[in-house]
């Protein structure tokens, strides 16, 4: 149930995340399942555990196997399994199916190819992109952050795309490659009246004065590429940019996250150094498209101060 497949190539870095949810303050213990041997946390080891992450720097074929992670949260220990397979490097250009990440589809309007698993690594731009082993060149291809954008997508753009980047760990560099297929399709979607998944209507969000707080506005708009769809936050009915409080900023999440084929958008409202006056504001999560506008209101309430009595 809580098992995740991970794979990589020998002599490349591989970082695997525990498939169970954790928190920064909760320790995570990692074990090699076959022997129940604990994975060390010291970074001098080639394979070591670092909280939620298990790092192979670099990976070896012999590292293949099942690894157990246990999130030591209070009340319940959450156990997960990482099924790791390390393959020998292929001498030819062909990328076998077992090394491929999920296929992504694009259209003329939407042609982003995300580099799989890159968020687990400490990398710096630019990414290198290859199609069928050839380095991509030309103005139609733009490597932007962790994804590749292809302008004026054509059916000939379908194929296997490999991203290559360098992971840095304590000054040492390790190469990582990841490949996924890209297919081009005619967009046949539909749009619906926006559905806000979070926050709940009239939700009360508890915050601590002086700490940072995040509110996520998440909504879905239909299937396929949306002609017009937006999520945004308002404060007391005013756009964030017009409100003029530099401590409160909104930040776009992943542009279109297709879960269950739905086109969804996220917008995170970040409040730095929460102040008493922030509790008096009305926070509106707005989702709009051609069908109309939906609004969910959130208010902040003071998380009770941590009074220590001894």
């Amino acid at each position: 149930k809580f098992s995740k497949q991970s794979w990589g190539l020998e002599n490349e870095a591989l970082i695997v995340r525990c498939p169970r949810q954790g928190k920064p303050s909760y320790t995570v213990d990692w074990y090699y399942s076959q022997t129940n041997k604990s994975i060390p946390t010291q970074e001098r080891n080639r394979v070591f555990a670092s909280g939620q992450l298990l790092k192979f720097l670099p990976a070896a074929v012999a590292d293949s196997g099942i690894y157990t992670c246990i999130v030591r949260s209070p009340t319940f220990n959450r156990t997960g399994y990482a099924n790791v397979t390390i393959y020998k490097k292929q001498s030819d250009c062909n990328v076998p199916d077992y090394l491929m990440y999920s296929t992504v589809s694009g259209s003329e309007k939407n042609s982003k190819i995300y580099c799989p698993t890159i968020d687990l690594y400490n990398w710096t731009a630019p990414l290198e992109w290859f199609k069928n082993c050839q380095a991509l060149q030309g103005s139609r291809y733009r490597a932007h952050k962790s994804f590749l954008v292809i302008d004026n997508v054509m059916t000939e753009d379908a194929g296997d795309y490999t991203c290559k980047f360098i992971h840095n760990e304590n000054g040492a560099n390790y190469s990582v490659t990841a490949t996924r297929s890209f297919t081009v399709k005619d967009e046949q979607g539909f749009s619906l009246f926006p559905v806000i998944g979070a926050p709940a209507q009239n939700e009360i969000k508890e915050v601590e004065i002086g700490k940072n707080a995040n509110l996520t506005c998440s909504a879905c708009f239909g299937k396929g590429t949306q002609f017009l769809a937006a999520v945004l936050w308002q404060l007391n009915g005013t756009k964030i940019t017009d409100f003029g409080e530099p401590r409160i900023q909104q930040e776009e999440g992943q542009n279109q996250s297709f879960s269950n084929g739905l086109a969804c958008l996220d917008m995170v409202l970040r409040i730095a150094d929460v102040k008493e006056e922030d509790l008096l504001l009305q926070y509106d999560c707005l989702a709009l498209n051609l069908h109309g506008l939906r609004r969910h209101t959130v208010r902040l309430s003071r998380k009770n101060p941590i009074d220590h009595h001894s």
């Epitope: 303050s25 909760y26 320790t27 030591r72 009340t75 959450r78």
Partner: antibody, heavy 123, light 111 residues
């Protein structure tokens, strides 16, 4: 307003079944672990079962194999399917909210409780 | 299983006077994250329990400052500095380090 409302309690014969429901509102249900706690008349509180945000389930020894906890995040609902009921299961059953996994900060224990629903097992 | 014990099991207090309830756990409630998972609840007659104190000594929102919690490891105390009529009910300590266990409860009544 943060609220939990239980339903589904009633009178049932030993060996019978009941399904309790808990409707949550006013908070993002999917990010919280949820729990059932019961209290027999004039007695103390007893933890019964829990379900975490990822669907993993936990049971006290006295109900393991007979009770099944589940959740439906899309409906903001928590359930407790109770089979092979015994007289000793007679109690008020409370639905209660636990840890918020969207908040890296403090854990408030069981901070929100419903009013409870009464289950009576008797022939 | 962690066992929780409370003393006294009942307490009769004059309004305005202090009250103290002790709670002991069969093992330390200190977690590897540095926090201690001990909570205090008040259950008023005919009502569900309500959270008073979390993490040994932190008052939950809306809880009057006459309530205070202290202790560490396995020994904990809830104090009411000046008992009021509305404080009657059963007080429970609870651990959530390993699953959940409640103490047997302390019934507080007004003299």
């Amino acid at each position: 307003e943060v609220q939990l409302v239980e339903s589904g309690g009633g009178l049932v014969q030993p060996g019978g079944s009941l399904r309790l429901s808990c409707a949550a509102s006013g908070f993002t249900f999917s990010t919280f672990d949820m729990h059932w706690v019961r209290q027999a008349t004039g007695k103390g509180l007893e933890w019964v079962s829990s379900i975490d945000t990822e669907g993993d389930t936990y049971y006290s020894g006295s109900v393991k194999g007979r009770f099944t906890i589940s959740r439906e995040n899309a409906r903001n609902s928590l359930y407790l399917q109770m089979n092979s009921l015994r007289a000793g299961d007679t109690a008020v059953y409370y639905c209660t909210r636990g840890e918020d996994w969207s908040d890296d900060d403090y854990y408030y224990g069981l901070d929100v409780w419903g009013q409870g629903t009464t289950v009576t097992v008797s022939s | 299983n962690i066992v929780m014990t409370q003393t006294p099991l009942s307490l009769s207090v004059t309004p305005g006077q202090p009250a103290s309830i002790s709670c002991k756990s069969s093992q330390s409630l200190l977690h590897s994250d540095g926090k201690t998972y001990l909570f205090w609840y008040l259950q008023k007659p005919g009502q569900p329990p309500q959270l008073l104190i979390y993490g040994v000594s932190n008052r939950f929102s809306g809880v009057p400052d006459r309530f205070s919690g202290s202790g560490s490891g396995t020994d904990f105390t809830l104090k009411i500095s000046r008992v009021e009529a509305e404080d009657v009910g059963v007080y429970y300590c609870m651990q959530s380090l390993q699953l959940f266990t409640f103490g047997p409860g302390t019934k507080v009544e007004i003299k």
